[in-house]
């Protein structure tokens, strides 16, 4: 659909005569009739197949025709057509004399014709005005013409319908050739598809309007490129939704079981070495001079009673010092200047001379010791507690404080690792020499049967239209991640596509 526009510019009829040569009285009051028709190999009389238009009287004899409107008529003249413009045409322009006010063909005498032109033309849509001039012996007509498309019609032949829109069915304007030009933020054949936020993950994100990034189930983050881990996952991550892959040192279904107490809590003090020995269990190996479960106790070097013969021990920064009683000397007061005559043996100890009376030895009654029977026996000296148990003096007796996993008077008994039911989800526990082993029931795995490897809900391929399936470990169900253009719990429904359009 388009318009053939004809601009009449100038008509010259200096002598003011008709085609017959007869003069007009008083002058030639001139109007025009225009006939536009299909291209003919030889221009021939016949119907004006592309349309006709007439002007009012535009002037007398010779005159220039003003642009826009002249005496109520339009200039350029408009000859609309509602078909594909063929590119060629035949044009007939007649100049007539109007003796009166009635310009109808039947009201005019046949000899009122002033002049007539008939041409064959070729004209592309949108071309600049084409100027032409037709001269006869008596008249001259200067005119120009062009073809433009009607609103919403485009292309070389005005045959492409395109109406700009910005609604559910499209967001575009029209290019000169009738192709769509999407508005910023839209794409697709009909510019219906929003361009999501730059970087929005192709599969895991989508949008309903430009520069948006909405995440599909199981994904999060500004660009929907971060998976959502299993609900309740504490110290774990995921690479696909609903996973809970434990960080180093953590275990269990939710990665909330501490398998690396040493690293996470640093329980050993004073530079002791920490060793993990099970869930929330550890052993501290103390540096010399320290003791206690966490090596938190500083050992006094005097605690081992190094001073003999009643010498008193004094702690010093770099060791200890023995203050010897009279008659004794040496680092540990081990040398005596006494003999049995000096009654050196305490607590009922009996003295025996040695080396011809130059020295002596005390034989101590039970519960006493020392070179002069001056010390009460420390029942912990022999380190009777096994398996790292701590020995405690309790008056005449002693007792052992055992480390976790050991029991008995001397901590000589290994408590069964299985006693505290360490195997999760009904796993069977087996005691081993250096720990335990869990035999897991179907659907679970891991050192303590803490990892759920439940029946894969995705195994039956429940998702349609090439959707991605994810298993929700907490419910043993699946979630379908739909590709663009599909919805539904199984992505089984296509998003309603718009009706087809003629362009």
């Amino acid at each position: 659909s388009g318009v053939f526009q004809l601009q009449l510019q100038e008509f010259i009829n200096e002598r003011g005569v008709l085609a017959s040569g007869r003069p007009c009285e008083p002058g030639c009051r001139t109007f025009f009739r225009v006939c536009l028709k299909h291209f003919q190999a030889v221009v021939s009389p016949g119907p004006c197949t592309f349309g006709t238009v007439s002007t009012p009287v535009l002037g007398t004899n010779s005159f220039a025709v003003r642009d826009d409107s002249s005496g109520g008529g339009r200039n350029p003249l408009q000859l609309p057509f509602n078909f594909t413009w063929p590119g060629t045409f035949s044009l007939i322009i007649e100049a007539w004399h109007a003796p009166g006010d009635d310009l109808r063909p039947e009201a005019l005498p046949p000899d009122a014709l002033i002049s007539k032109i008939a041409i064959q033309g070729s004209l592309a849509v949108g071309q600049n005005w084409l100027l032409d001039e037709q001269t006869s012996t008596l008249t001259r007509l200067r005119y120009s013409y062009r073809v433009i498309c009607s609103d919403n019609y485009y292309g070389d032949n005005c045959s492409r319908l395109c109406k700009k829109r910005n609604d559910h069915f499209g967001h575009y304007v029209c290019q000169p050739d009738g192709n769509l030009s999407c508005l910023p933020g839209w794409t697709g054949e009909y510019c219906q598809q929003p361009i999501c936020l730059s970087g929005c993950h192709e599969q895991n994100g989508y949008c309903s309007k430009p520069a948006e990034c909405l995440c599909r189930p199981g994904w999060q983050g500004r660009l929907c490129n971060e998976c959502i881990p299993h609900n309740g996952c504490r110290h774990g991550t995921c690479s696909t939704p609903w996973q809970c892959t434990c960080d180093e040192g953590w275990g269990g279904l939710f990665c909330d079981q501490d398998l690396n107490y040493c690293t996470h809590h640093s329980p050993c003090k004073n530079g002791a070495t920490c060793s993990n020995s099970g869930q929330r269990s550890y052993t501290c190996t103390c540096r010399p001079g320290y003791t206690g479960v966490d090596c938190e106790l500083e050992l006094s070097e005097c605690d081992s009673n190094p001073c003999r013969n009643g010498g008193s021990c004094k702690d010093q920064e770099d060791g200890y010092h023995c203050l010897c009683p009279p008659g004794y000397y040496g680092l540990h007061c081990e040398h005596s200047t006494l003999s049995c005559a000096d009654s050196p043996c305490f607590n009922g100890g009996s003295c025996r001379e040695r080396n011809q009376g130059a020295n002596y030895a005390c034989e101590c009654p039970p519960n006493f010791t020392g070179s002069n029977c001056e010390k009460k026996v420390d029942r912990c000296t022999s380190n009777p507690c096994a398996n790292g148990g701590q020995c405690l003096n309790r008056g005449p007796s002693r007792m052992c404080r055992c480390r976790p996993g050991f029991t008995g008077t001397y901590c000589e008994l290994h408590v069964s690792d299985c006693a505290r039911n360490p195997c999760a989800h009904g796993g069977t526990c087996h005691d081993l020499e250096n720990g335990l082993m869990c035999t897991c029931p179907a659907g679970f795995s891991g050192r303590r049967c803490e990892v759920r490897t439940s029946i894969d809900a995705c195994a039956s391929s429940p998702c349609f239209n090439r959707a991605t399936c994810y298993t929700d470990l907490s419910t043993d169900t699946f979630v379908c991640n739909c590709p663009y253009g599909f919805v539904g719990s199984r992505c089984e429904f296509p998003v309603g596509l718009p009706p087809s359009f003629p362009w």
Epitope: Q40, A41, V42, V43, S44, A118, I119, Q120, S122, T135
Partner: antibody, heavy 118, light 107 residues
Amino acid sequence: EVQLVESGGGVVQPGRSLRLSCAASGFTFSNYGMYWVRQAPGKGLEWVAFISHGGGITYYRDSVKGRFTISRDNSKNTLYLQMNSLRAEDTAVYYCAALNWELGIDYWGQGTMVTVSS
Amino acid sequence: DIQMTQSPSSLSASVGDRVTITCRASEDIYSNLAWYQKKPGKSPKLLIYAANRLQDGVPSRFSGSGSGTDYTLTISSLQPEDFATYFCLQGSKFPLTFGQGTKLEIK
């Protein structure tokens, strides 16, 4: 008096060229589409080429397309037919004509003979 | 291309006879048809155009009729000067095509 006078015909060998001219007088040459028509000895009339009044449109019969060129010089009131790669079957009397039946115009020249022979 | 089939190819008639020549187009030519008279050594002469319009200066014994694909030239009363070859020409589309001609001879 309306006159169309063809010239340039003659005997030519196959493969050679000729240029026909048609001089117009007695009418407004620039107003009309012009035609070349030929008649081979003992045969009927055959249209050859067309050019519109301003020279913007040209048409040719298939057998001469690419070999013949129609042109016009409105300032000299002259129509031309450049004929290249001539063949024996191009032998004919060539007429120029101004045809516009809408205006009752039908002017023909007297014809010029073109003979293509070795 | 539009084919023009003219008949008869030759015709013998006497002065005063009424003669009819026909042309059939291979498709609708919308009355864009002319009839020409051609004598040896002479240029074609237009008799009828637009199927039925008599060219200025042509005797009224010549008439044309028809539409669509079928057209007729009638000479109501043959005169001695009418013995010639007659051609139809379609001016609807390029290539322009002529009928094969009808040679009108004296009986």
